[in-house]
């Protein structure tokens, strides 16, 4: 008769490497008498005999994982006990190996030149895959702009036109290689004018060709504006080559004008625009223009840029030595004075001052400025800036302002033409909304159209200083 013998594990468990979806087997050879009861644990948790993912054979000495999963990683132990002596245990690790897999592949990207592009490439695998990128047929080299991130994503700073192309990411480890689908990086470029139209001084009745060249991705469209309106006469010829558009406007010249070339292209829902302008003057007209009180030109200043109509011609008074600089200096001074007025008054006063100093202009033999309509001037005085005006007039009457100290270019309302006379004799300015809570004796009018923005400035009782020489009556 055999003597009882405590269990001894003769084949200790070893580390097992297994690929996902493959079979992994742990062998736990035990010598003992009587035959031991063998149980298995994974990460100290008992593996149930009826778990269909496992097969336990050879009296419990063989544990087979039938289809390895990523989550099966861990420490597996066999415990043998036959009631003689203590239980014995042996442990070994299961390392789940995995061929590279791309879990978040890159997608097609459209990006504007100069911005940052990120092409994702998230991977799985054991050992951890290394990620590289291919552009076209060549391996992509990293540099100061181009980097492969820890996550595997490709980051391109300050995207350039030459970055456009087809990309794929490659995930590689000792078990294999995975490739993503090819994706396209498209680089869009804002419209830019390469060649601006040139100004011309010609004789009456001449033909002139204005040429404007622009580039961009997508290829821009070019339109022409004459004195702020769409060109009404003349012929336009266009050609496109290598993303460059060339537009030629041929004109029969019977009057001087300001011609603006506008290049536009679309980026998603947004548009980019580039402009260049040229003047066409008539040689014989220069004498009569010198005799007049001023000239018409596009406003090129900054202060009134947001207030004046885009591309409109305004009147510059040649009684100043340098009209454009002088008028801009005047409005700049006025603007600083306006910083102290109420949020209700400020946009109205800004519009009034800009349109009074830079009046709409009709080019002709004698350029003619068009003053603001009296009604708008009165609206500013009595609705929007009533408090400021009262304070200003009170100070003026008490002699607080000496002539020339704070000369704001404020019109005298009563001297302005009325919109009810000749509708072409004055400029009707856009409607400004005014609210009842700010005004005691005037009606509240609510506009469904966007009204002029009223900046969120602190309310102030200080007025904007105006010389009595420019009273508003």
């Amino acid at each position: 008769e055999k003597l009882p013998k405590a269990p001894v594990i003769t084949t200790p468990l070893e580390t097992v490497d297994a690929l996902v979806e493959e079979v992994a087997t742990f062998m736990c050879a035990v010598e003992s008498y009587p035959q031991p009861e063998i149980s298995w644990t994974r990460n100290k948790i008992l593996i149930k005999l009826f778990d269909t993912r496992y097969s336990i054979r050879e009296n419990g000495q063989l544990l087979t994982i039938l289809s390895v999963e990523d989550s099966d990683d861990g420490i597996y132990c066999c415990i043998a006990n036959n009631g003689v002596g203590g239980a014995v245990e042996s442990c070994g690790a299961l390392q789940v190996k995995m061929k590279p897999k791309i879990t978040r592949p890159p997608i097609n990207v459209k990006i504007i030149e100069g911005l940052k592009a990120v092409l994702p490439c998230t991977t799985m695998g054991n050992p951890k895959p290394s990620v590289s990128w291919i552009k076209g047929d060549n391996a992509l080299r990293e540099n100061s702009r181009i980097a492969v991130l820890e996550s595997g994503s490709l980051r391109i700073h300050n995207v350039q036109k030459e970055d456009a192309g087809q990309y794929r990411c490659v995930a590689k480890n000792s078990l294999g290689t995975a490739y993503s689908k090819l994706v396209k990086l498209e680089v869009e470029v804002f419209a830019r004018i390469l060649r601006a139209p040139e100004s011309h001084n010609v004789t009456f009745g001449s033909f002139v060709t204005l040429r404007c060249t622009a580039i961009g991705i997508p290829v821009p469209t070019i339109s022409w504006i004459e004195n702020g309106n769409a060109v009404s006469s003349g012929s336009i010829q266009e050609s496109v080559k290598d993303r460059v558009i060339d537009s030629r406007l041929q004109l029969f010249i019977t009057k001087p004008g300001l011609y603006t070339c506008i290049a536009t292209n679309k980026h998603g829902e947004k548009f980019s625009t580039a402009k260049a302008a040229a003047t066409v003057s008539i040689a014989e007209w220069s004498k009569s223009q010198k005799d007049s009180q001023g000239y018409c030109a596009q406003y090129r200043g900054e202060v009134c840029d947001a207030v004046l109509a885009k591309d409109a011609l305004v009147f510059f008074n040649t009684s100043y030595r340098d009209p454009e600089d002088a008028q801009e200096l005047l409005i700049h001074t006025a603007w600083n004075e306006l910083k102290a007025v109420s949020p209700l008054c400020r946009p109205a006063a800004e519009a009034l001052l800009c349109n009074h100093l830079f009046q709409e202009c009709s080019p002709g033999v004698v350029p003619t400025p068009m003053p603001i309509c009296r009604e708008y001037c009165l609206a500013v005085k009595e609705l929007f800036c009533a408090k400021e005006w009262q304070a200003m007039e009170g100070k003026a009457h008490r002699g607080l302002y000496r002539s020339g100290m704070h000369l704001l270019p404020v019109p005298e309302c009563s001297k302005l033409p009325s919109m009810h006379r000749d509708p072409t004799a004055c400029t009707r300015l856009p409607y400004l909304d005014y609210k009842k809570e700010n005004i005691t004796t005037f009606p509240s009018i609510t506009s469904s159209r966007p009204s002029a923005d009223i900046p969120n400035l602190p309310a102030s009782t200080s007025s904007f200083a105006v010389s009595p020489a420019y009273s508003m009556t």
């Epitope: 109509a309 709409e360 009604e375 708008y376 009165l378 609206a379 005085k381 009595e382 609705l383 009563s414 009325s418 919109m419 009810h420 006379r421 509708p423 400029t427 009707r428 300015l429 856009p430 409607y431 004796t441 005037f442 009606p443 009018i445 469904s448 159209r449």
Partner: antibody, heavy 118, light 112 residues
Amino acid sequence: EVQLVQSGAEVKKPGESLKISCKGSGYSFTSYWIGWVRQMPGKGLEWMGIIYPGDSDTRYSPSFQGQVTISADKSISTAYLQWSSLKASDTAMYYCARHSHWGFLDYWGQGTLVTVSS
Amino acid sequence: DIVMTQSPLSLPVIPGEPASISCRSSQSLLQSNGYNYLDWYLQKPGQSPQLLIYLGSNRASGVPDRFSGSGSGTDFTLKISRVEAEDVGVYYCMQVQQTPYTFGQGTKLEIK
């Protein structure tokens, strides 16, 4: 509160003269144009003309030029519409209304009914 | 003179239903400032006219939002999204682009 209050109804004979009034209050009377509008019995609105009380500048519709006179007395904030010789065809409701600084008629008087009948 | 033409001249409407009035001018009422100098007025029975819409599409103070104005240049529309009994009266369009200012003939809105 802005208000335009017109004078009461008038019954006149053909050939007589008449001056109806419109008194403004609650705003700067001299800074707004006042318009006159005629409405004949069962008919639509007709714009007659306007006055700027600040300097008594007037504009008339060609249909009413020479037929009526529009005037104003800024010292009492009142505008007037007058006839030197009424005709039966002048029978109508006459409204005064204030032209806002953007042109639209934002406040109206209650109307003056003028009846011309022999 | 600028001639204003309204249609229809009579408009019977069931309460709760929408209504639309058209106004056409013989010249463009669009100014260089982007605004159309056209206004809409309502004259309720026995009352003075009242301003509804100014500068083409702006609702006057106190006017319910079921009233809206649209259009540009020479063609304009006044819409009432759901007519109520209190909306009965005569609707007039008026141009204030140039003197003499002129009204349309009027559209009489009545409840069916």
